[in-house]
């Protein structure tokens, strides 16, 4: 429960949330686990803690592992674990099941395609969107807010979506890209 | 100094309804999630009710579910338990404790607890 | 609902020996799980949280261990203040759900 998978594209911005929450006015220390150290949260390093986040800005196959955060309040600290994976990019168009976020399905009356982490993430519009690879593009696609929305849902619409961002960071750009499969059910 | 102080027990026939209140005071009452356990004479503890802080959220056993309603008045430090349709087994010292962490979806210890307020449901 | 067993019911131990409650959970509760130290007449007093940790002002000779199902609270060497009831409780889900305690009594 409170040790999450994370992962992400070398290159690409990753901005990890610590599992165990607390109150916003609580402290969050960051630590690798393996050797106990202290990550910093000057904004100037790659790799910086900001409060319950640790961010990768960009991120690099080197950062994989196990990192602790420990949030603490006046009287109690309580610890999680963020497993970090960070794979070399793709040069074909397959996405492998490991970067796949969770299936969603949809029908003809519901057809949102959430774009996985985006929360996490300072990012503006537009947001991009792709099927196996492919830029989507007509009047039955529209992207809305942090959603695809597919109007007139049919069988052929499955199938696994990417959705793509700007990360801004100090006014430093990163790309973000995100990978789940849409099913479509019969009504 | 954290302190939590129950009242509004006392002896009240089976059917019957009673009100408790649990002052708090020293802490930012407000923020914190409060709860309401109980303990039958001789008995183990139970967790009866749960309240979210400025939320709202409430949170309910199944013994007490329809017949118990705990609320707050974040204005004047208070928490309630209004206990309706009362039976025999509802007799028990009813504690007040605050959950001193708390987010949306999640619950943790209890790490001040009021001295308790007897209830007894008897004809 | 989450079931908590503990056992023994009765622990009967002289002061300075080694205490060793149990705490079996129906499933799974990873570490979310604390322990009350109870005495006559006062309300529980919260001794461990997140399985292991100790609270604020809880003497050392305390300590917890285990996840998931099975947990131990160990009182290393009894002193004659710790005679007294003890409760785990689990706070992984609602309803909220105790154990049915352990009475440490003066063998």
């Known amino acids: 429960k409170f040790s999450k998978q994370s992962w992400g594209l070398e290159n690409e911005a990753l901005i990890v949330r610590c599992p165990r929450q607390g109150k916003p006015s609580y402290t969050v220390d960051w630590y690798y686990s393996q050797t106990n150290k202290s990550i910093p949260t000057q904004e100037r390093n790659r790799v910086f803690a900001s409060r319950d986040r640790l961010k990768f800005l960009p991120a690099a196959v080197a950062d994989s592992g196990i990192y602790t955060c420990i949030v603490r309040s006046p009287t109690f600290n309580r610890t999680g674990y963020a497993n970090v994976t960070i794979y070399k990019k793709q040069s074909d168009c397959n996405v492998p099941d490991y970067l796949m976020y969770s299936t969603v399905s949809g029908s003809e009356k519901n057809s949102k395609i959430y774009c996985p982490t985006i929360d996490l993430y300072n990012w503006t519009a537009p947001l991009e969107w792709f099927k196996n690879c492919q830029a989507l593009q007509g009047s039955r696609y529209r992207a809305h807010k942090s959603f695809l929305v597919i109007d007139n849902v049919m069988t052929e619409d499955a199938g696994d979506y990417t959705c793509k961002f700007i990360h801004n960071e100090n006014g430093a750009n990163y790309s973000v890209t995100a990978t789940r499969s849409f099913t479509v059910k019969d009504e | 100094e954290v302190q939590l102080l129950e009242s509004g027990g006392g002896l009240v026939q089976p059917g019957g309804s009673l009100r408790l209140s649990c002052a708090a005071s020293g802490f930012t009452f407000s923020i914190y999630d409060m709860i309401w356990v109980r303990q039958a004479p001789g008995k183990g503890l139970e967790w009866v009710s749960s309240i979210r802080g400025e939320g709202g959220g409430t949170y309910y056993a199944d013994s007490v579910k329809g017949r118990f309603t705990i609320s707050r008045d974040n204005s004047k430090n208070t928490l309630y338990l209004q206990m309706n349709s009362l039976r025999a087994e509802d007799t028990a010292v009813y504690y007040c404790a605050r959950d001193p962490w708390s987010t949306e979806g999640s619950f943790f210890v209890l790490d001040y607890w009021g001295q308790g307020t007897l209830v007894t449901v008897s004809s | 609902e989450i079931v908590l067993t503990q056992s023994p019911a009765t622990l009967s131990l002289s002061p300075g020996e080694r205490a060793t409650l149990s705490c079996r959970a129906s499933?799974?509760?990873?570490?979310?799980l604390a322990w009350y130290q109870q005495k006559p007449g006062q309300a529980p007093r919260l001794l461990i949280y997140d399985a292991s940790n100790r609270a604020t002002g809880i003497p050392a000779r305390f300590s917890g261990s285990g996840s998931g199902t099975d947990f131990t609270l160990t009182i290393s060497s009894l002193e004659p203040e710790d005679f007294a009831v003890y409760y785990c409780q689990q706070y992984i889900t609602a309803p909220l759900t105790f154990g049915q305690g352990t009475k440490v009594e003066i063998k």
């Open positions: 499933q799974s509760v990873d570490d979310d």
